[in-house]
Interface confidence: low
């Protein structure tokens, strides 16, 4: 349309228009985590505030058991936060004796679940190793990028453990998407 | 909309449309940052380039004293990294002699402030313990997410030590945030 | 436009409206990299997988020889992490004997290149210096940012040492525009 | 269209300092580089150095740091660039030219004389 | 410092002839983003230089194709084909790969 003169007689577009405010969003807030089964060999899922506060879902974006919910197919920006805190890790003590030690380290993994498709697609992961040395360490895995979703995907947040996550502060932990 | 057929005399739309490139976008880069007084437990703003290098700001969204001033309603995502730097953190000379110590930090928080309510909100904190040992240490600190915002809020970056922050270049420090 | 009863009749809008999945859009993944050279005090760029896995360019937006090119001038979304592994650093062997000393570092760069502009600009920093002590380590650094870009501008991902980049899995490393 | 004006010539005395503009036309000033070259009487083209008018980045050739020091005022498309401690060495005429992937428009040339 | 070498320093010519410039540098100007930033100026005298050819071999606007640039690496040739009363002057080859950017001495076209 570069250059185009705009009138609503010769209007040249090649798919529906579309309100900008109509579109699916959803920002996620950290909640206490209440210990949980989750499968051998898989991180556990974190679950999240959905309206209180600074989070809220619209536009037939809904929160359910950990998973957000697409309602419409298109191109997603899909972001989160996740506040890690812990002590000492034991890696420490075992380098200052001298022997290296392969890191503890923290995870977090956004993940795509297709129910059509039998195995669970990790479209994000940001993966740290700590060898802290402090008596108590604390930082935070920042993760967004853009994802193709099918109207029916369901969207979650894992951690590598969910003990270490910072839980106090609707703003250190967060997780969203956007409909673009 | 989906599989609609579009032409003008049966658009059906919810809410009024508006051109993209209409929408009030800002992207703020570092500049050296003056002393300055800040409240007793409140950490300092930063101040930035609103118009020089890669820095803009458009479609009424203004920056002035520290602040972006949202000029309509709506669903913003915003952003921000500040790169640190510092010398050794006296955390890791304690450390060294033996003595754990609660770790030196670095934080960032993007603040909401609205004229209206007397506390400002935080809308996304990054914040993560500092035990370097090497002489000479540096970090970013990335923050991004969508937030609802109301025609007038104001947006701010506080940072927990503003001696930290390395203004040398454009591109490690940055806030930025639009309309969606 | 705000309150604006919706009509074509009376639709008063500034710009050429366009459907949203009609603009340019890209996210690229992780390959394995091939030894490159590279002009002295310049960092390698990377080169990306661009349409298998999670991988896509849609709407002009094309890939080729390690850049984005951009299709249409507008403000883009510009983002990439960088996951970097490495052995322990010198830095921290040194340290060990006591001798403080400038740490080793990971960077990653998101460049402009103009093709009527000689130099190219740098839009995005993530610099972390790493003064790491177990015997491995891991960890991303994460950028985006809104920019004004031109049609034919071309972005890159450039990375201080290319032989530290984790090519291993698709959500690891990744690097994606998308029109505002 | 694409247009540069310089100031008028110049006749200054040895030890001064001149200050020499040139005015944009025709395109996004702060967009575009403004360089800088000197040619002497019957001689060839020097590169003295750029100024990019939206951050005020400037890119020196050695031979002219401390000589020249390039500015511009983006509220009237100007560039300038100031010439301290002259000799009859700088008795040149002083040309601007915008650079895009090349020196495209050039303004018509400052011709200084430094005599006592 | 790159040196840009041109040859010949004076070159006459017949009206009609076809002409040749070489222009050399002292180490390649492939810049850092793969262009080669090579140009191609006359000046005529008690004007301002006019640019010809730029990043190697392009013609720039409203210049005759008469003109034609080519090279890489660190050889360069502008060429006229025939050679008309107005490209009489002096040709300036100049690089803007690296900093400082440099030009040519010159080769004065003038009439044989």
């Known amino acids: 349309l570069k250059g185009q003169e705009f009138a609503p007689s010769h209007q040249q577009v090649y798919a529906p228009l579309r309100a900008d405010g109509d579109k699916p969003r959803a920002h996620l807030t950290v909640v206490r985590q209440t210990p949980t089964q989750h499968f051998k060999n898989q991180f556990p899922a974190l679950h999240w505030e959905h309206e209180l506060g600074l989070a809220f879902t619209k536009n037939r974006m809904n929160y359910t058991n950990k998973f957000l919910l697409i309602p419409e197919s298109g191109d997603y920006f899909i972001y989160s936060q996740v506040t890690f805190r812990g002590m000492t890790s034991e890696c420490s003590e075992i380098r200052q004796a001298g022997r290296p030690n392969k890191p503890d380290s923290i995870t977090v993994v956004i993940t795509k679940v297709t129910d059509s498709y039998p195995e669970p697609t990790q479209l994000l992961m940001g993966t740290k190793s700590v060898c802290e040395v402090g008596s108590n360490w604390f930082q935070p895995i920042y993760l967004g990028a853009m994802f193709s979703l099918q109207e029916g995907d369901k969207l979650m947040v894992n951690v590598s453990d969910i003990s270490l996550v910072d839980y106090t502060k609707e703003d250190k932990t967060f997780f969203g998407a956007f409909l673009l | 909309l989906k599989g609609q057929e579009f032409a003008p005399s049966h658009q059906q739309v919810y809410a009024p449309l508006r051109a993209d490139g209409d929408k009030p976008r800002a992207h703020l880069t570092v500049v050296r940052q003056t002393p300055t007084q800040h409240f007793k437990n409140q950490f300092p703003a930063l101040h930035w380039e609103h118009e020089l290098g890669l820095a803009f700001t458009k479609n009424r969204m203004n920056y002035t004293n520290k602040f972006l001033l949202i000029p309509e309603s709506g669903d913003y995502f915003i952003y921000s990294q500040v790169t640190f730097r510092g010398m050794t953190s006296e955390c890791s000379e304690i450390r060294q002699a033996g003595r754990p110590n609660k770790p030196d930090s670095i934080t960032v928080v993007i603040t909401k402030v609205t004229d209206s309510y007397p506390e400002p909100t935080q809308l996304l904190m990054g914040t993560k313990s500092v035990c370097e040992v090497g002489s000479n240490w540096f970090q970013p600190i990335y923050l991004g997410a969508m937030f609802s915002l109301q025609e007038g809020d104001k947006l701010m970056v506080n940072v927990s030590d503003i001696s930290l922050v390395d203004y040398t270049k454009e591109d490690k420090t940055f806030f930025g945030a639009f309309l969606l | 436009l705000k309150g604006q009863e919706f009509a074509p009749s009376h639709q008063q809008v500034y710009a050429p409206l366009r459907a949203d999945g009609d603009k340019p859009r890209a996210h690229l993944t992780v390959v394995r990299q091939t030894p490159t050279q590279h002009f002295k005090n310049q960092f390698p760029a990377l080169h990306w997988e661009h349409e298998l896995g999670l991988a896509f360019t849609k709407n002009r937006m094309n890939y080729t020889n390690k850049f984005l090119l951009i299709p249409e001038s507008g403000d883009y979304f510009i983002y990439s992490q960088v996951t970097f592994r490495g052995m322990t650093s010198e830095c921290s062997e040194i340290r060990q004997a006591g001798r403080p000393n400038k740490p080793d570092s990971i960077t990653v760069v998101i460049t402009k290149v103009t093709d009527s502009y000689p130099e190219p600009t740098q839009l995005l920093m993530g610099t972390k210096s790493v003064c790491e002590v177990g015997s491995n380590w891991f960890q991303p650094i994460y950028l985006g940012a809104m920019f004004s870009l031109q049609e034919g501008d071309k972005l890159m991902v450039n990375v201080s040492d290319i032989s530290l980049v984790d090519y291993t899995k698709e959500d690891k490393t990744f690097f994606g525009a998308f029109l505002l | 269209q694409v247009q540069l004006q310089q100031s008028g010539p110049e006749l200054v005395k040895p030890g001064a300092s001149v200050k020499l503009s040139c005015k944009a036309s025709?395109?996004?000033?702060?967009?575009?580089?403004i360089n800088w070259v000197k040619q002497r009487p019957g001689q060839g083209l020097e590169w003295i150095g750029w100024i990019y008018p939206r951050d005020g980045r400037t890119n020196y050739n050695e031979k002219f740091k401390g000589k020249a020091t390039l500015t511009v005022d983006t509220s009237s498309s100007t560039a300038y660039m100031d010439l301290h401690s002259l000799t009859s060495e700088d008795s040149a005429v002083y040309f601007c030219a915008r650079y895009t992937s090349s020196l495209d428009y050039w303004g018509q040339g400052t011709t200084l004389t430094v005599s006592s | 410092d790159v040196v840009m070498t041109q040859t010949p320093l004076s070159l006459p010519v017949s009206l009609g002839d076809q002409a040749s410039i070489s222009c050399r540098s002292s180490q390649s100007i492939v810049h850092s983003n793969g262009n080669t930033y090579l140009e191609w100026y006359l000046q005529k005298p008690g004007q301002s230089p006019k640019l010809l050819i730029y990043k190697v071999s392009n013609r720039f606007s409203g210049v005759p194709d008469r003109f034609s640039g080519s090279g890489s690496g660190t050889d360069f040739t502008l060429k006229i084909s025939r050679v008309e009363a107005e490209d009489l002057g002096v040709y300036y080859c100049?690089?803007?790969?690296?900093?400082?950017?440099?030009f040519g001495g010159g080769t004065k076209l003038e009439i044989k």
């Open positions: 025709g395109y996004t000033f702060t967009s575009i580089d």
């Open positions: 100049f690089q803007g790969s690296h900093v400082p950017y440099t």
